[in-house]
Interface confidence: low
């Protein structure tokens, strides 16, 4: 019953938000030069002073403004806008994107290491050495260190003593030869800004998790990158959003966003930069994309020669070369309850993760049965018009009622027959969100430049993060989709009902094969495959919508799978999704068997 009430409450809240309650306060703005009226949010907004820009669509006070840097610039420790370094050299790849408060960081591309460091980059990259015959890899080469070899121990084949040694050599065949730099002429990292140049990660982490640091995602009072209006937009007019500069396109939120660049040697242009769509790049013939990026590929590799049943085993982002190994056999389910602290895992086993160097894939290179339609921005399309609202309302009432009645009857019958306590409310423990950027933050009032600041109000948060959500899954595996952080764009305003998670209900009872996609900590996509031979009337309790981070300062709000704690008695569902803690051996998220 509680789930029904919660769903109805959410829908009612959505309906309220679809019809804004605030009356326009235009009169309070008139004649007040420090404020302006924003028709989109129907309220008076504080006008940020010159040189400062809003941290949200409709600032209310001076603290809602902060110094704003342009794309490819970051706010340094001295609070100055400083150009981010560029990774445009062929031997460099982007390790971390240019954020509002930290520079882009470049590192040597896979197969190379840095011999001469530079601030946030590398001045000289050399190929990793290859271990000579009779030697094996002790430590594989990383972006910072060369390969370390050691003599092969007796009785072990020197060729394949470790998986690293079975990979194709990443440089010439002369073992331990003096590494050669790729571009000796370029001895220092470029710090000049690139206007629309090589900025693969400006659209960092795709728009699935909408990079808050992406400068294009900032709500701005006047001009956007690529636009140079000579004054703030006239109120209610879209005049300053008509045309973007070359190499910029007008995105769906009406912002001029830099088109990605295909200037890397391993990329070719698939579609050109148009006025309303980004250039798209793809790996050149003979290469496949190992690490996807929005409208591009962050890392192309030659077609790998892998056995049919192999999976990519990523290692340390770009730090180590990718190796291929057979996938692990199915492991025993770990039925341990969550530790007392209830922290969500920072990651699961690497064998199940597809690492994305600062970008989450837009076109996910993995089969998924999860019904997520991706729009051209990579956002799940959840169109919640008024019609859909009523359809959903009716559906929820019908499905919820029948689910409850069916479940109740079945559970009670079983309870009498087996004297078993099968109703487990899912304890949705709020994950402690980890900040991706480890640098100390300036102050609690400084918000991430792109993050949405329309934080849930108390009532809304109360609904969206109910500590106990009784989930009766006799009708199948119902789960809430993890939605992306909403954009903070000038047209954003308070989130509409489309921002609410939409329950999806499957009517299959057996062989539920749910492949869920979790966006973790900005640069990892976890593909959790749950294969469960489930008895009839038993489903999976999936993740509820995670709470938005209080200050929205993390580069990306992680959408973690929820974890269960020791369940209380008296529920209907005896199957739960157990997600491994970081560092646990079991590599797969598994379904716990019936207790």
């Amino acid at each position: 019953m509680r789930v029904l009430l919660a769903a109805l409450g959410l829908l009612f809240l959505g309906a309220l938000r679809a019809f804004p309650q605030d009356r326009p306060f235009e009169d309070t703005c008139h004649g007040n030069p420090s404020h302006y009226y924003d028709k989109a949010v129907r309220r008076c907004c504080y006008r940020c002073p010159m040189g400062l820009f809003p941290t949200q669509q409709c600032p209310q006070r001076p603290t809602d403004c902060r110094k704003q840097c342009e794309p490819d610039y970051y706010l340094d420790e001295a609070d100055r806008c400083t150009a981010c370094v560029t990774c445009s050299r062929d031997d460099l790849v982007e390790k971390t994107p240019c954020a509002w408060n930290s520079s882009r960081v470049c590192e040597c591309r896979p197969g190379m290491f840095c011999s001469t460091s530079a601030v946030n980059s590398c001045a000289r990259c050399f190929f990793h050495s290859v271990c000579p015959a009779g030697m094996i890899v002790k430590f594989p080469g990383t972006a910072q260190k060369n390969t370390v070899c050691e003599p092969a121990s007796p009785g072990v084949s020197p060729a394949c003593a470790s998986p690293e040694n079975c990979k194709e050599p990443s440089s010439g065949t002369i073992p331990q030869a003096k590494p050669t730099p790729v571009s000796p002429a370029t001895s220092s990292a470029s710090t000049m800004p690139v206007r629309g140049g090589t900025r693969l990660a400006q659209e960092a982490a795709s728009k699935l998790t909408r990079a808050p640091d992406s400068p294009s995602s900032v709500g701005r009072p006047s001009s956007d990158p690529g636009l140079s209006p000579t004054q703030p937009c006239p109120e209610g007019s879209g005049d300053c959003r008509k045309q973007c500069e070359p190499d910029y396109y007008l995105d769906e939120a009406g912002r001029c966003t830099a088109c990605v660049s295909c200037s890397r040697d391993d990329l070719v242009e698939k579609t050109p930069c148009a006025w309303n769509s980004s250039r798209t790049c793809e790996c050149r013939p003979g290469m496949i994309c190992a690490t996807s990026a929005t409208n591009s590929c962050a890392r192309c590799v030659p077609y790998p020669i892998c056995a049919a049943e192999t999976v990519t085993k990523p290692q340390d982002m770009a730090e180590k070369d990718t190796t291929f190994e057979a996938p692990p056999l199915g492991t025993q389910p770990d039925c341990n309850p969550t530790p007392e602290n209830g922290e969500a895992p920072a990651s699961t086993s690497p064998t199940q993760s597809l690492l994305v160097d600062s970008q989450a894939s837009k076109t996910l290179p993995i089969p998924t049965s999860a019904p997520v339609a991706l729009s051209s921005t990579g956002k799940p399309v959840l169109d919640a018009g008024p019609v859909l609202f009523w359809v959903i309302l009716v559906l929820v009432v019908v499905v919820g009622s029948s689910a409850f009645l069916l479940c109740h009857r079945r559970a009670c019958r079983k309870r009498i027959r087996q004297k078993l306590h099968l109703c487990y409310p899912v304890q949705t423990s709020q994950p402690k969100l980890e900040l991706v950027d480890s640098r100390p933050r300036r102050s609690s009032t400084q918000l991430r430049s792109g993050a949405s600041v329309t934080e849930p109000v108390a009532e809304e948060r109360g609904l969206m993060s109910q500590p106990l959500m009784e989930t009766c899954h006799s009708v199948g595996a119902a789960y809430l989709e993890s939605l992306p952080l909403q954009d903070a764009s000038p047209a954003g305003g308070p989130s509409s009902p489309r921002d609410l998670p939409e329950p999806r209900v499957s009517t299959e009872h057996t062989n539920n094969k749910i492949e869920k996609i979790y966006i973790m900590k900005a640069d990892t996509v976890i593909v959790g495959t749950v294969k469960a031979e489930l008895p009839e009337g038993r489903g999976l309790a999936g993740p509820a919508e995670p709470e938005l981070e209080e200050e929205l300062e993390a580069d990306h709000t992680p959408h973690y799978p929820e974890q269960e704690t020791e369940p209380p008695l008296g529920s209907c569902s005896d199957v739960m999704l157990s997600v491994e803690e970081e560092g646990k051996e079991d590599p797969l998220p598994t379904a716990a068997s019936g207790k």
Epitope: P49, G51, C69, P71, C81, A83, S228
Partner: antibody
Framework: EVQLLESGGGLVQPGGSLRLSCAAS????????MSWVRQAPGKGLEWVSY????????YYADSVKGRFTISRDNSKNTLYLQMNSLRAEDTAVYYC??????????????WGQGTLVTVSS | QSVLTQPPSASGTPGQRVTISCSGS????????VYWYQQLPGTAPKLLIY???QRPSGVPDRFSGSKSGTSASLAISGLRSEDEADYYC?????????FGGGTKLTVL
């Protein structure tokens, strides 16, 4: 040492055009917003225009909006002010100034010596 | 007419303390920092006070700034003859930068 040196001033007829330049040195030019501030003879200071470090944001005083255009060339460490449709009241010493100390701050911490623009028939 | 209002002139004798006022509104001084500039005769302006009361390096501690509501003031203690100059207050306005009309300080 931070230095700002204006040039391009002179005598021009009403309705005419003039382009002022400001050569900057001694700091990372592209990291700073820059402004033009003018001072009519015997009068006070009047802010004219502002441009951000990467040229994405530009602001103008109402009195010059639509007639003046601020721009910069970061590769040349130079700030420009293109003045069109000049009027007699635009006669002033034009200073180029570096826009300030940082977060929540809008001071002009360094100024050039100025260049005189005289609009007269 | 300037957005910020300053007295056109002020005077004092050497060693004396002089205060120059600056009055604005909620949209400039009221919601933003105040800056003070000194312009010696025939020279470019020089930043004297930033962030209401902070002195850049090289500015003597005889100069101090304060702000209260929509008004600000510059105080010069131990007045010296070399302090004779024009003093301008300034503040960020909405998408602009506003200066006071300036106060000519005369050291008698």
């Amino acid at each position: 040492e931070v230095q700002l040196l204006e040039s391009g001033g002179g005598l021009v007829q009403p309705g005419g055009s003039l382009r002022l330049s400001c050569a900057a040195s001694g700091f990372t030019f592209s990291s700073y917003g820059m402004s033009w501030v003018r001072q009519a003879p015997g009068k006070g200071l009047e802010w004219v225009s502002y441009i951000s470090g990467g040229s994405y944001y530009t602001y103008y005083a109402d009195s010059v909006k639509g007639r003046f255009t601020i721009s910069r060339d970061n590769s040349k460490n130079t700030l420009y002010l293109q003045m069109n449709s000049l009027r007699a009241e635009d006669t002033a010493v034009y200073y180029c100034a570096r826009y300030g100390y940082g977060y929540y701050d809008g001071s002009f911490d360094y100024w050039g010596q100025g260049t005189l623009v005289t609009v007269s028939s | 007419q300037s957005v910020l209002t300053q007295p056109p002139s002020a005077s004092g004798t050497p060693g004396q303390r002089v205060t120059i006022s600056c009055s604005g509104s909620s949209s400039n001084i009221g919601s933003n920092y105040v800056y003070w500039y000194q312009q010696l005769p025939g020279t470019a302006p020089k930043l004297l006070i930033y962030r209401n009361n902070q002195r850049p390096s090289g500015v003597p501690d005889r100069f101090s700034g304060s702000k209260s509501g929509t008004s600000a003031s510059l105080a010069i203690s131990g007045l010296r003859s070399e302090d004779e100059a024009d003093y301008y207050c300034a503040a960020d306005g909405p998408y602009n930068y506003v200066f006071g009309g300036g106060t000519k300080l005369t050291v008698l």
